[in-house]
């Protein structure tokens, strides 16, 4: 008995469907046993579906009822499943196991990793620190959603809407602005991007003079 998945990693967009491939080969014609799909995470393992060759009965894990379909050719050699309405919770490693009692009680397995793709949500831009000349401030940018994890980059424009170089690396977040001055004034755009989308937010920086203590 041999079991194989034709791909190691599959990528599919949230809300869509994906077929996790699994095929098996055996010389046995009188089949008694199971096809089982499990989802393996570091925190736990959970049953996706079990199919019994004898009873032809499917048993689905809670999160997969009405959302997972087993191939119509499960008896022939195709143990693939299709998962509908993908969510971020479906990210993980899936293991296809085929067990045949009549094949010397052999159990064979194969795995496929599923990456559910989600474009970045519109990032939140914020300023940490007081916008006073001479101070240091931090510009932060974060997308609540995005898979794979979004990459962040910054661009800076002066009051005349001309792009200007940033003194520190433009990728990553937060962006640290040291010893701010009127020269720092302008607006800053953070771009959040991954394989499936791009979003941005901007912040206006307008340093004010230190208050006079009389």
């Amino acid at each position: 008995l041999t079991v194989e998945t034709t791909q190691d990693i599959l990528r599919a967009a949230r809300g869509r469907s994906v077929t996790l491939p699994c095929t098996y080969n055996t010389y046995v014609s009188d089949r008694e046993g199971f096809i089982q799909w499990d989802k393996l995470l570091r925190s736990q393992t959970e049953r996706v579906v079990t199919w019994n060759f004898v009873t032809k009965k499917y048993i689905y894990g809670n999160r997969y009822e009405n959302r997972v379909r087993v191939s119509n050719d499960a008896e022939l050699s195709n143990a693939s499943i299709t998962i509908d309405q993908l969510t971020m919770d479906d990210n993980g490693t899936y293991e296809c196991s085929v067990s045949l009692m009549s094949d010397q009680d052999v159990n064979a397995k194969s795995r496929v990793r599923l990456l559910v793709l989600v474009p970045p949500s519109k990032p939140d831009c914020s300023i940490q620190g007081e916008m006073v000349i001479g101070n240091n401030i931090q510009l932060t940018c974060h997308s609540a959603e995005g898979s794979p994890s979004p990459q962040y980059s910054w661009k800076s424009y002066n009051a005349q809407n001309q792009q200007r170089p940033l003194t520190q690396p433009v990728s990553g977040e937060p962006l640290l602005l040291k010893n701010i001055s009127t020269e720092t004034a302008g607006y800053y755009i953070c771009t959040s991007s991954n394989d499936v989308g791009i979003e941005s937010c901007n912040i206006t920086v307008a340093p004010r003079p230190p208050s006079m203590n009389i």
Epitope: G33, F34, I35, Q36, L40, R42, Q44, T45, E46, R47, T50, N52, I59, Y60, G61, N62, E65, E95, S97, V98, S99, D105, V106, N107, A108, K109
Partner: antibody
């Protein structure tokens, strides 16, 4: 004939360590997830730990997390449970059990007694 | 973790009686519920898997039913060798959990 033969139990002091072994034969050990289950004196069965067939996914009951480590050597057809920082409440008969698709815990070892006492 | 509650915790019955043991899960576990028989000094024995499938070699007087959160194990006609402790166990997800057990004694 499928068999799971256990060894390594015994008496150990609180805070001590012990390693249990489970030798498999009669089936393709490397294809099956394996588990440890225990039964304390006068108590019911308690699942302790599970390991995937290839040994890369390990799961533990909260009661043993951080103290017990499950491992396997597929070349030697052997399953292990390394127990450390042992407590009196870990006193139990420990069983290894094979987990098959559809039929979890279908074959069990004979059990080995671990006694934690000063 | 999913909790399993068995009832009754102990039961006295006679040879030939029909006996039912129930197991309730704290959340839905579909049909991923298994039943084991355990006798003192022996390893537990799998009787029923995925709620209602009889393990190979287990007498047909044992049967299981249920799905979601409520499950039952029925022994249609008790035999002398059936006096033991019975456990339900969920295999829907880790941590796998067992019920507290039902001790079946001779009346």
């Amino acid at each position: 004939q499928m068999q799971l033969v256990q060894s390594g139990g015994g008496l150990v002091k609180p805070g001590g360590s012990l390693r249990l072994s489970c030798a498999a034969s009669g089936f393709t050990f490397s294809s099956y997830n394996m588990n440890w289950v225990r039964q304390a004196p006068g108590k019911g069965l308690e699942w302790v730990s599970s390991i995937s067939s290839s040994g890369d996914f390990m799961y533990y009951a909260d009661s043993v997390k951080g103290r017990f480590t499950i491992s396997r050597d597929n070349a030697k057809n052997s399953l292990y449970l390394q127990m450390s920082s042992l407590r009196a409440e870990d006193t139990a008969v420990y069983y290894c059990a094979r987990e098959g698709p559809g039929t979890p815990f279908d074959y069990w070892g004979q059990g080995t007694l671990v006694t934690v006492s000063s | 973790a999913i909790q399993l509650t068995q009832s009754p915790s102990s039961l006295s019955a006679s040879v030939g009686d029909r006996v039912t043991i129930t197991c309730r899960a704290s959340q839905s576990i579909s049909s991923f519920l298994n039943w084991y028989q355990h006798k003192p000094g022996k390893a537990p024995k799998l009787l029923i898997y995925v709620a209602s499938s009889l393990q190979s070699g287990v007498p047909s007087r044992f049967s299981g039913s249920g799905s979601g959160t409520d499950f039952t194990l029925t022994i249609s006609s008790l035999q002398p060798e059936d006096f033991a402790t019975y456990y339900c166990q969920q295999s829907h997800n880790t941590p796998y959990t067992f019920g507290q057990g039902t001790k079946l004694e001779i009346k």
